[in-house]
């Protein structure tokens, strides 16, 4: 698969590649863009190019058949004809068909080929598709890009996160022209440098919720543990002690005891990562020492942990609202009323209980409101509309307030029961006691970081100050790594 140049040479790579002597793609109406292929992506790309004022020429093996699927303004022709008409070409065919263009290499000399392909699996081939294309067409300027965009997004117009396109090429001018083209198509181009980045760009669309995997596993593990914990305490214990069958509690009551604990634990994990990062920087007296991989991964997953916390809190609210609707609740209510009448009790009002429930429901609603605000500001379009100060205030300050109020919600829910022996079934503490452990540690940690002596030192470290001992040791093997000014959640 090699191409040996023995005579002649490709045109200078620094030349302008576009027709009509346009340097860069400033005026779309004058530019003809080629698209090789006639699949869904090619169709959607063509529609977008036309909408943005470009003239499009489609190269197809079967132009007669392909022309039926494209707008009439599009020039659908043979590959060879298409390649002679344009200098910027989208290669919208699968990797295994690249070689079908091989006979036309001489028509591609000095032209920009934009590889938009993806594979079926991560690292499916030894080299990226773009690098393979470059090996087949050494005299062409290969640019990787647009592969992270779906055909759907191309047709409808990109929204939010789908506006980002990653672009890389070994030729700076070619890369710049494709970046400009991406802007003209209303995308946000991200320059990833040389073609060696193509492998990573090609792997991006194949990653299925990479940052979500860890948080989801953590959430499921916590949910399983707390569900079994509640099941043992609230179903197995009464059955073992009094042969009392409370299995009806499993679908709603046990689940609803699990959900809030998972929610508050996940929310605590969001802020615990930031505290550990701060502790790490304080310990080493520098912000330039890279965090250990586990902490770095944890810090990257905070948004996902926060959103999962919000999800569990929302489901907890839904379950709680449904509690009075249950048939079991009605029966218990009637039984209590009957027993009250039977015991000749006219007034069962308990001021303390009334206040307790009013308070914990109120705190619950407040914390849900704050969590909702945190979740909404995690949406890319919303976070993009906020400046860094606003964003970090919502995510960090209000986030801690949400955690504090959630902790009060749990504390008031538990009330005195943490100190009553009857609630320690099988010698295990009540659920809410377990739920309070992590939030309490996080809140305590935050208070410690607020202490003037520590907060001053942390501020200095974040401004670039370093412990002299660290400087004496030298920074051999360390990588500059700056943690965010404020710890953000979602």
């Amino acid at each position: 698969m090699e191409s040996i140049s023995m005579m002649g040479s490709p045109k200078s790579l620094s030349e302008t590649f576009l027709p009509n002597g346009i340097n860069g793609i400033k005026d779309a109406r004058k530019v003809t863009v080629g698209v090789i292929g006639s699949g869904d992506f090619a169709k959607s790309l063509t529609i977008r190019l036309i909408r943005c004022g470009y003239h499009v020429v489609i190269g197809s093996r079967n132009p007669k058949f392909a022309s039926e699927f494209f707008p009439h303004v599009v020039d659908v022709t043979h590959h060879e004809d298409a390649l002679t008409k344009t200098n910027i070409i989208f290669v919208a065919i699968h990797r295994e068909h690249y070689t079908s263009l091989w006979d036309l290499r001489h028509l591609l000399v000095g032209k920009i080929l934009i590889d938009v392909s993806n594979n079926m699996r991560i690292n499916q081939y030894p080299e990226s598709n773009a690098e393979y294309l470059a090996s087949l067409f050494p005299d062409s300027l290969i640019v990787k890009g647009f592969n992270v965009v779906s055909a759907w997004a191309l047709q409808l117009g990109p929204k939010d996160a789908s506006r980002q396109v990653y672009i890389c090429s070994n030729n700076i001018q070619a890369r710049q022209q494709v970046i400009e083209l991406a802007r003209q198509l209303n995308f946000i181009p991200i320059d990833l440098g040389s073609l060696s980045s193509a492998r990573e760009i090609e792997n991006l669309p194949l990653r299925l919720f990479t940052l979500w995997r860890g948080p989801v596993v953590v959430a499921i593990s916590l949910a399983t543990f707390f569900f079994l914990y509640s099941f043992v305490r609230d179903v197995i214990h009464p059955y073992a002690r009094n042969q009392q069958s409370d299995f009806y509690k499993i679908p709603i009551e046990i689940v609803n005891k699990t959900l809030p604990i998972v929610a508050i634990t996940l929310l605590s994990l969001v802020y615990l990562a930031g505290l550990l990062a701060a502790a790490y920087q304080l310990y080493y007296g520098t912000k330039y020492r890279r965090f250990p991989p586990w902490l770095e991964t944890w810090l990257q997953c905070r948004k996902q942990l926060g959103l999962l916390s919000f999800f569990f809190a929302m489901v907890h609210v839904a379950y709680s609202l449904c509690l009075p609707m249950r048939r079991s609740e009605r029966y218990l209510f009637l039984n209590m009323a009957y027993q009250q009448v039977h015991a000749n009790i006219e007034n069962s009002w308990n001021e303390e209980e009334v206040w307790r429930i009013e308070m914990y429901i109120s705190f619950g609603i407040m914390s849900l409101g704050l969590l909702s605000l945190l979740a909404v500001t995690s949406i890319p379009s919303v976070s993009n509309a906020l400046n860094w100060r606003e964003f970090s205030f919502i995510q960090s300050t209000l986030g801690y307030v949400a955690l504090l109020i959630s902790t009060f919600h749990v504390l008031i829910y538990g009330w005195k029961r943490a100190f009553e022996e009857e609630y320690y079934r099988f010698y295990t503490p009540p659920n809410f006691v377990l739920a309070l452990v992590l939030p309490s540690i996080v809140i305590l940690g935050k208070i410690i970081l607020f202490l003037p002596c520590i907060s001053r030192k942390l501020k200095r470290i974040k401004k670039g100050w370093e412990k002299s001992q660290f400087l004496e040791e030298g920074m051999g093997g360390t990588i500059p790594h700056v943690s965010p000014e404020r710890v953000t959640v979602m």
């Epitope: 005579m7 043979h78 060879e80 006979d103």
Partner: antibody, heavy 124, light 107 residues
Framework: QVQLQQSGPGLVKPSQTLSLTCAIS??????????WNWIRQSPSRGLEWLGR?????????DYVVSVKSRIIFNPDTSKNQFSLQLNSVTPEDTAVYYC??????????????WGQGTLVTVSS | EIVMTQSPVTLSVSPGERATLSCWAS??????LAWYQQKPGQAPRLLIY???TRATGIPARFSGSGSGTGFTLTISSLQSEDFAVYYC?????????FGPGTKVDIK
């Protein structure tokens, strides 16, 4: 009428270089609408395309992966011929070697004209 | 690379009878397929290209059909000079590949 006349030794020793030449008449090696190919045929491998050379404002040489590291095609415009050089031969390279033309207006066509073939035996 | 397969390996036919040879490609080759005839001690000769177009000087009894992955060469009435080995070859994708051949012999 295009004619391809092959020449070269029929016996080559292992690890040596196999050299064959294909002289063209009725067409030009530097034609813009033709590609010049080498194909070999052995009982074990059947017909195997080895590669091609063609001219489109510069020379392009394409080699099949299996022999890519050992093979060289040399077009000679002055003599209107092209040659095959296969280095470090082994007994597995024993085959009948053919040169053939492809009409190539942009896209490859079939092998429409073939040389008479040269049986090359690799043996010590 | 595209793998070409042919069937049958050997076809025994009486002169004057019809012979049908099949060729399959491991992936679509569109209509970029050629058929060759090879007699002992000779170079292959082009019969059909573009899956169905007869090459110059090829008698009308030879016909080709198919596209994509399945192709057929039909010899309507076998003559004595038609007993040979027939190869199919794809020239759609690099590297160009041949089938293993079908030997047509006298029954």
């Amino acid at each position: 009428q295009v004619q391809l006349q092959q020449s070269g030794p029929g016996l080559v020793k292992p690890s040596q270089t196999l050299s064959l030449t294909c002289a063209i008449s009725g067409d030009s090696v530097s034609s813009n609408s033709a590609a010049w190919n080498w194909i070999r045929q052995s009982p074990s491998r059947g017909l195997e395309w080895l590669g091609r050379t063609y001219y489109r404002s510069k020379w392009y040489n394409d080699y099949v992966v299996s022999v890519k590291s050992r093979i060289i095609f040399n077009p000679d415009t002055s003599k209107n011929q092209f040659s095959l050089q296969l280095n470090s031969v082994t007994p597995e390279d024993t085959a009948v070697y053919y040169c053939a033309r492809v009409r190539q207006d942009y896209r490859s066509g079939p092998f429409d004209y073939w040389g008479q073939g040269t049986l090359v035996t690799v043996s010590s | 690379e595209i793998v070409m397969t042919q069937s049958p390996v050997t076809l025994s036919v009486s002169p004057g009878e019809r012979a049908t040879l099949s060729c399959w490609a491991s992936q679509s080759v569109s209509s970029s397929l050629a058929w060759y005839q090879q007699k002992p001690g000779q170079a292959p000769r082009l019969l059909i290209y573009g899956a169905s177009t007869r090459a110059t000087g090829i008698p009308a009894r030879f016909s080709g059909s198919g596209s994509g992955t399945g192709f057929t060469l039909t010899i309507s009435s076998l003559q004595s000079e038609d007993f040979a080995v027939y190869y199919c070859q794809q020239y759609n994708n690099w590297p160009f590949t041949f089938g293993p051949g079908t030997k047509v012999d006298i029954k």
